[in-house]
Interface confidence: low
């Protein structure tokens, strides 16, 4: 969250790959985990604008992909998130950090692989149930963050093919016992619970039986509540803007927060020729703040109508909750009407802070 002015050239940047860093970090995550990649500036100096790339394609921020200048977070990772990730300088495309990420199918979460562990004809005439993949059943205690998907598996066989049923804390467990229900995939000997909550904690037992016998396995599930954090602001928003005198401008700010956020739009101003007050903090005016009739959606947009040269300057989206505060800033450049076309043609929109 740099407070400095970011010079940003929007348009085609020359693809000049820099030297590949000597070391490529190999990282392994479980399905459903949050992938976190950190890329501090080399030598601790300023890094400038950066872009995160996966398998050669720029990553687009979303509710699941949180992109910051020095950090990338991919929430609820799946197999598709495996690949080569790099953080590059936006203008030069020089690679600053490189990671090889593999997302494995942790036994605690993730989607089923189609057809895997299906009931198989073992060729045995008759027989009591037995575990076909005991090595996949080693992890008896599962601790997962709330909102993740959990899957318990008890792959088994027998002749005749055994049935499978599930107990929670020793009692029959059915879909109506939890909000969001459960998925019982008998062909894959699995129980799937999506978006787990603290009330899903407990002991889950699979009971596999046929007329020759019965086997069972108990798993213990602990649901970790999400640790609260200050609001997360979507990278790249608000974006720098260049506008013609008299036109309308919109700044956007996307806020993610577990706790109720308090959003404000600020404009940096000068008082008696100074940009900062006696406490060393910038002078600002509050342009938009939460009111009795304002929704969070409305607060995520700042609209400026019929802009004048006085509207030019730095604008800040500020979001706070009970944990702390986050802010992103952007600049508005206001051009005289007749200069606008020339500026756009020659520079592909140049934003100078």
């Amino acid at each position: 969250e740099s407070l400095g002015t970011e010079q940003r050239v929007v348009g085609r940047a020359a693809e000049v790959p820099g030297p590949e860093p000597g070391q490529q970090e190999q990282l392994v995550f479980g399905s459903g985990d949050a992938v976190e990649l950190s890329c501090p500036p080399p030598g601790g100096g300023p890094m400038g604008p950066t872009v995160w790339v996966k398998d050669g394609t720029g990553l687009v921020p979303s509710e699941r992909v949180l992109v910051g200048p020095q950090r990338l977070q991919v929430l609820n990772a799946s197999h598709e998130d495996s690949g080569a990730y790099s953080c590059r300088q936006r203008l030069t495309q020089r690679v600053l950090c490189h990671f090889s990420v593999r997302v494995t199918d942790a036994p605690s979460s993730g989607d089923d692989e189609d057809g895997e562990d299906e009931a198989e004809d073992t060729g045995v005439d008759t027989g009591a149930p037995y575990w076909t993949r005991p090595e996949r059943m080693d992890k008896k205690l599962l601790a997962v963050p709330a909102a993740n998907t959990v899957r318990f598996r008890c792959p088994a066989a027998g002749n005749p093919t055994p049935s499978i049923s599930w107990l929670k804390n020793g009692r029959e467990f059915r879909g109506e016992h939890r909000i969001g229900g459960i998925k019982l995939r008998h062909q894959q000997w699995s129980l799937v619970m999506e978006s787990v909550v603290p009330s899903d904690r407990g002991n889950y037992t699979c009971v596999v039986e046929n007329k020759f016998g019965s086997i069972r396995q108990t798993y213990t599930l602990d649901v970790l509540e999400r640790s609260p954090h200050r609001p997360i602001l979507q990278a790249g928003l608000p974006a720098n803007q260049t506008a013609v005198l008299g036109s309308d401008v919109e700044f956007h700010c996307k806020v993610y927060s577990d706790a109720q956020p308090h959003i404000q739009w600020l404009k940096h101003v000068e008082v008696n020729g100074s940009k900062v007050g006696p406490d060393g903090t910038p002078y600002v005016t509050v342009l938009k703040t939460a009111g009795a009739n304002t929704t969070d959606k409305e607060l995520e947009v700042l609209s400026l109508h019929n802009v004048t040269f006085e509207d030019a300057g730095e604008y800040t989206c500020l979001a706070g909750n009970s944990i702390g505060f986050s802010h992103h800033s952007a600049w508005l450049v206001v051009l005289p009407a007749e200069e606008e076309l020339v500026e756009a043609d020659e520079a592909g929109s140049v934003y100078a802070g």
Epitope: G277, P278, T281, G324
Partner: antibody, heavy 126, light 110 residues
Framework: QVQLVQSGAEVKKPGASVKVSCKAS????????MHWVRQAPGQGLEWMGW????????NYAQKFQGRVTMTRDTSISTAYMELSSLRSEDTAVYYC???????????????????WGQGTLVTVSS | DIALTQPASVSGSPGQSITISCTGT?????????VSWYQQHPGKAPKLMIY???NRPSGVSNRFSGSKSGNTASLTISGLQAEDEADYYC??????????FGGGTKLTVL
């Protein structure tokens, strides 16, 4: 839960110095500004200054400039306030108070003291 | 040293409403919407009751409300209860002194 635990009461002679500690727990110590506020017997609250535990940066009220020093030890999540050249009018309860301002956050006009220490009574008497 | 002026004391009967005023200048209360109110029981640390003029932290009763007009901020307590008896302090950002408190108001519930 957030807790600020201060050191015990002190009795000092005029001209001496006192150093009060404030141990934080239940949150990331380096993420929030720590302020010091004092209250003389039967009087109101008086703001003394803040320290940014992340950077060690400080800002003192004009009245205390030159006499107060605020420091921190991040390894034990503890903030300290040292007041020198004590006089009888410095007799007061000294509070540390966490403000909701993140140390990543520059917009310090909006200062909310959401958690307070229990207070340390400093008596200055000859 | 006291930059913000509060009445030394106010009183009211249970169930009544009372208002405590906090008067400053255009460089503090009047210039910014950053007025907070704290409640302090004898021998205890202060507790945040109102911030940003009129916002209540979670856990604070909705009997407490704040407002501002010009250079004066006000704290109103409705449906007065015995446990409301305490000292109340206003606090504001001040463009010269940074953080200033009022002198405090002793609330007595009759």
């Amino acid at each position: 839960q957030v807790q600020l635990v201060q050191s015990g009461a002190e009795v000092k002679k005029p001209g001496a110095s006192v150093k009060v500690s404030c141990k934080a727990s239940g949150y990331t110590f380096t993420s929030y500004y720590m302020h010091w506020v004092r209250q003389a017997p039967g009087q109101g609250l008086e703001w003394m200054g803040w320290i940014n535990p992340n950077s060690g940066g400080t800002n003192y009220a004009q009245k205390f400039q030159g006499r107060v020093t605020m420091t921190r030890d991040t390894s034990i999540s503890t903030a300290y306030m040292e007041l020198s050249s004590l006089r009888s009018e410095d007799t007061a309860v000294y509070y540390c108070a966490r403000s909701m301002n993140s140390t990543m956050y520059w917009y310090l006009r909006r200062v909310l003291f959401d958690h307070w220490g229990q207070g340390t009574l400093v008596t200055v008497s000859s | 040293d006291i930059a913000l002026t509060q009445p030394a004391s106010v009183s009211g009967s249970p169930g009544q409403s009372i208002t405590i005023s906090c008067t400053g200048t255009s460089s503090d209360v009047g210039g910014y919407n950053y007025v907070s109110w704290y409640q302090q029981h004898p021998g205890k640390a202060p507790k945040l009751m109102i911030y940003d003029v009129s916002n209540r932290p979670s856990g604070v009763s909705n009997r407490f409300s704040g407002s501002k007009s010009g250079n004066t901020a006000s704290l109103t307590i409705s449906g007065l209860q015995a446990e409301d008896e305490a000292d109340y302090y206003c606090q504001s950002y001040d463009m010269y002194n940074y953080i200033v408190f009022g002198g405090g108001t002793k609330l007595t519930v009759l």
